[in-house]
């Protein structure tokens, strides 16, 4: 007689990443009886919510429900109905909401309140909506990539099942770039972490990890651009800003009120004799790079060494996974290959930024102009941040791996967050019981 397939004993989880520029919903799945095994949870769906980040709904909170509908309905379709009630839903908001909270705690709470009200209308088990800290964002990103790379597994393998696997248990560092903040997280080599705020201690699967992390608020790619514009307009002689970070022939009108809307530009704020100014692109990588460097204060460091703005950074150690906007931008620029040296990346950026705007628009006709116009700045910013901000060198550049997905799951903080909140990362190594692992043939 033929064996009848038993119903799949699986569980699901949903995490919404409420970022500064957009919200994404992730659905994860895992075998119910293997919850404590490492590497069993994987992503089955990503749904990008149409529209901006939730912090932009502050004056129209009643629209949040409609905004979330499509992706929540998608989750309803993907997850079997019998599992709906059991499926936890978490929403974590990042730096966009941190910035809103800095301006008004009441407004930030109003947004989260409406988020809860909207998500409570679905049949899932809603667990909470909150603003995660920068430290958590860094830590959970680090957990995600190392979980997916199999770094927490005690089983050594003679074959490689994941990309970038160096077949050792050395963890990867995590480099995360968002729209409003950027995180750097790694295990330093025998180095004391000189500032307690940047130190994390984990015990995962029976092993202790001393992890360094820092989140630079206002140094995500979008807020960094606002900072740069606010800094440069201070010294402009009129309402024309000739900007090396935009392609030659590019023109855009910016409202001064929009420029000063974010707390990230407060330090550059001044009374200007005009309400609007026009960006005129001149497309010069070197000048753009120089302008970006002025955002990093490297003159002050109260520690043995710093990244910038007086923030402690230990010597870099090991390999790093660079994900989120680090990956999206470099992927667009076709610079994610392991074979491309830092010098080659710089060369390519020089050429790209110098290309006339009309030419760029023709070459990338399918790309929204808003995004297309900013790749020169974003690519240059990534190089500046990694080289001057975090002190990567031409030699250590090869230790940076630009990662979008690992084993089909997106690199980012959401998986680590869910693993932690559902208690799926044990402190101790689970005892191997018979039949608890698949048999290798």
């Amino acid at each position: 007689t033929q064996n009848k397939a038993l119903p799949e004993n699986v569980k699901y989880g949903i995490v919404l990443d409420a970022g500064s520029s957009h919200t994404s919903l992730y659905i994860y799945k895992w075998p119910a009886e293997k919850e404590n095994d490492t590497g069993v949870v994987h992503q089955v769906e990503e749904c990008r919510v149409k529209g901006p980040g939730i912090s932009k709904f502050v004056q129209k909170v009643n629209e949040i429900g409609i905004y979330l509908t499509d992706c929540m309905e998608r989750a309803r379709e993907v997850i079997p109905r019998s599992q709906h009630q059991e499926t936890p839903v978490y929403l974590g908001a990042t730096a966009g909401m941190r910035l809103l909270r800095m301006e008004s705690e009441e407004l930030a709470d109003r947004v989260l309140d409406v988020v809860e009200r909207s998500l409570s209308n679905y049949p899932f088990d809603f667990q909470g909506a909150r603003i995660i800290t920068g430290q958590e964002e860094g830590a959970y990103g680090w957990i995600t990539i190392n979980y997916l790379l199999g770094k927490f597994s005690q089983k050594t393998r003679w074959f490689s099942i994941v990309p970038y696997e160096t077949n050792n248990q050395e963890t990867f560092g995590a480099l995360d770039l968002g729209g409003a903040s950027t995180q750097v997280t790694f295990v330093p080599q025998n180095q004391t972490i000189e500032s307690p705020d940047n130190a994390l201690q984990f015990r995962l699967y029976g092993k202790d990890y001393n992890v360094y992390t820092h989140s630079f608020l206002c140094y995500g790619k979008d807020q960094a651009l606002w900072q740069k514009l606010a800094k440069d307009i201070q010294v402009a002689s009129n309402e024309i800003l000739r900007d090396p970070c935009f392609h030659p022939g590019y023109k855009k009108v910016v409202n001064v009120s929009d420029l000063y809307k974010t707390p990230c530009t407060k330090r550059f704020e001044m009374t200007l004799p005009f309400q609007q100014f026009e960006i005129q692109g001149i497309g010069n990588y070197q000048q753009c790079h120089q302008s970006i460097l002025e955002l990093f204060n490297t003159s002050y460091c109260p520690y043995s060494q710093c990244a910038f703005n007086g923030i402690f950074l230990p010597p870099l150690q090991g390999d790093f996974g660079a994900f989120s906007a680090f990956y999206f931008v470099m992927k667009f620029l076709n610079l994610t290959s392991e074979k491309v040296s830092q010098e080659k990346v710089t060369e390519m950026m020089k050429k790209f930024c110098a290309q006339p705007w009309e030419e760029i628009k023709t070459s990338y006709a399918g790309v929204k102009e808003k995004y297309l116009s900013e790749y020169c700045f974003s690519g240059t910013y990534i190089l500046s941040l990694l080289l001057q901000g975090y002190h990567f060198t031409a030699d250590s550049w090869e230790h940076i791996h630009f990662i979008g997905k690992i084993q089909g799951s997106d690199a980012g903080w959401t998986l680590g967050y869910m693993l932690n909140l559902t208690n799926m990362i044990p402190a101790e190594q689970p005892l191997s019981t018979p039949l608890s692992h698949s048999t290798y043939v």
Partner: nanobody
Framework: EVQLLESGGGLVQPGGSLRLSCAVS????????MSWFRQAPGQERDFVTA????????HYADSVKGRFTISRDNSKNTVYLQMNSLRAEDTAVYYC???????????????????WGQGTQVTVSS
Amino acid sequence: EVQLLESGGGLVQPGGSLRLSCAVSRGTFSEYSMSWFRQAPGQERDFVTAISGFGHITHYADSVKGRFTISRDNSKNTVYLQMNSLRAEDTAVYYCAAAWQTSPRRMMQMAGSITWGQGTQVTVSS
């Protein structure tokens, strides 16, 4: 970790009303689902009601539905239990409980990591 302090307990006649309060210190209050449990002498601790971080999800034990109402004021970091039409069988020590990023449904099942208050005595007697 959050700290919880209940108040408002006391002696009340059958059919009467009482409002319990639970003040929460430390932590970000809206990140916690809040709950009330009760324990009668010689009995297990039983679930009464729970409420989500911003108050849009509530669950009640069948025995108190329509009589008890849970609410919260996030500006005051306080959760309330309004108890009406009290009965002798409602006599118990009432405990406030908090669970971080945990649904009211899971609190009802006593799942997740729960922080407890010291309890306040409610006696319903004529």
